[in-house]
């Protein structure tokens, strides 16, 4: 009987010889539980596990805590991989996070964090980031130090408001902070002066809602 090979992330998939972009089945660390993820095997050397993608507004990102925990959407299009998987994965070894952004004028930019991990659910999947480089702003648009994750039914932000209800989507809101890549998707010519759009403040400023975003992770020693 042939032993089935399991992969923890897209870097392991890549190293096994699968170097084509696409959806692969990954396995939770120290578990048999599986999850489907999109692997980018071309960008920057490949081996990237896509943990978030926005591109056309086809998926509703105003979801519950549980949905953000387990993931939602379609890995071939707009989706959220799932906080629980990402938390478990990024606590096994050191990962980098690359955030790729597109605006409506044809420009692209990225933010690269040399160390990224999420705390456990008990700590509200708090985000931890170090070492920012890239073209999408010299200051991190994800507030530092990192904040707890908040959703419409899980209010962990610092605002007297509920950021997830005000701005829509689950995110590591501060009060409410300079970014929200899970905000409302606004089409071209409707994407300015939107306080609840897809925001990366230190690249495009206040009120600009982006055309496309991708969040991807890869082991630091890849």
């Amino acid at each position: 009987k042939e032993e089935q090979i399991s992969f923890r992330d897209c870097a392991e998939v890549f190293k096994s010889g699968h170097t084509t972009n696409g959806i692969y089945t990954l396995t939770f660390p120290n578990s048999t539980e599986e999850i489907k993820a999109y692997c980018d095997m071309e960008a920057g050397g490949g081996g990237w596990t896509i943990i978030q993608r926005r591109e056309d507004g086809s998926v509703d990102f105003q979801r519950t805590w549980k949905e953000y925990k387990v993931g939602f959407g379609n890995p071939s299009g707009e989706y959220w991989l799932g906080n629980e998987f990402v938390s478990q994965l990024t606590n096994q070894q050191r990962y980098v996070l690359k955030i790729h952004l597109k605006d409506w004028e044809g420009n692209e930019a990225y933010s690269l964090y040399e160390h990224f991990y999420l705390s456990s659910e008990e700590l509200n999947y708090r985000i931890h980031l170090k070492g920012l480089t890239g073209t999408a702003g010299k200051i991190s648009s994800i507030s530092q130090p990192g904040n707890d994750f908040s959703t419409k039914d899980g209010d962990n932000d610092k605002c007297i408001c509920k950021c997830s209800q005000m701005l829509t989507g689950g995110w590591w809101f501060d009060a409410c902070g300079p970014s929200n890549l899970n905000g409302m998707y606004y089409p071209q010519r409707q994407n300015t002066n939107k306080f609840n759009g897809i925001k990366w403040y230190y690249w495009k400023g206040s009120g600009y809602s982006l055309k496309a975003t991708t969040m991807m992770i890869r082991p630091a020693d890849f």
Partner: antibody, heavy 120, light 108 residues
């Protein structure tokens, strides 16, 4: 028509207590946070406290924490500010205001104010 | 606590003048949480601008707000006699809520 009417102000000795009332009409106070803002004579605006007590959200300025308490009686559509251990520096006109939690995200309606004087 | 530093603290201007008041926050603020109020002596404050730049219902269009991040501005394009008052910026995001110290607009 939305209206807020404060009452309960007056002269009180240091260490004394007062309860201010904010009677609302034109809206239901359980639907909106009520905030309290004060203004000492000749000074600027200072936020004191606010929130939705029924919903478990209450916030206080450090200067009044432990001495002031906000509450509400939804049957009377009235919010209250209980002020204990009053000090001379609490002397001010006190305003209640409705805080809208969507748009406009601001205090859109204010009461006329009630004067609290703390003096011996 | 977030400090809201307003400038100038007072200014003298004539009817028809363009007046600009600035407010600097001590840390990043989501624009939707910044408001401007007008207060006349012996009266309660009135909301002018919310969300840093949106004109509140019934407020004349000569008032406008702008800014983002930490720097916000209130502009009166052509000062009218009824505009002589004190103006306050305010952040409503983090407890304690904080106001600027006020800008008194006086007749020159």
């Amino acid at each position: 028509e939305v209206q807020l009417v404060e009452s309960g102000g007056g002269l009180v000795q240091p260490g004394g207590s007062l309860r201010l009332s904010c009677a609302a009409s034109g809206f239901t106070i359980s639907d909106y946070p009520i905030h309290w803002v004060r203004q000492a004579p000749g000074k600027g605006l200072e936020w004191v406290a606010g929130g939705t007590p029924a919903g478990g959200y209450t916030y206080y300025a450090d200067s009044v924490k432990g001495r002031f308490t906000i509450s509400a009686d939804t049957s009377k559509n009235t919010a209250y500010l209980q002020m204990n251990s009053l000090r001379a520096e609490d002397t001010a006109v006190y305003y209640c205001a409705r805080f809208v939690f969507f748009l406009p995200y601001a205090m859109d309606y204010w009461g006329q104010g009630t004067l609290v004087t703390v003096s011996s | 606590d977030i400090q809201m530093t307003q400038s100038p603290s007072s200014l003298s201007a004539s009817v028809g003048d363009r007046v600009t008041i600035t407010c600097r926050a001590s840390q990043f603020l989501s624009s939707f949480g910044v408001a401007w109020y007008q207060q006349k002596p012996g009266k309660a404050p009135k909301l002018l601008i919310y969300g840093a730049s949106s004109l509140y219902s019934g407020v004349p269009s000569r008032f406008s707000g702008s800014g983002s991040g930490t720097d916000f501005t209130l502009t009166i394009s052509s000062l009218q006699p009824e505009d002589f008052a004190t103006y306050y910026c305010q952040q409503g995001l983090l407890s304690p809520l904080t106001f600027g110290q006020g800008t008194k607009v006086e007749i020159k």
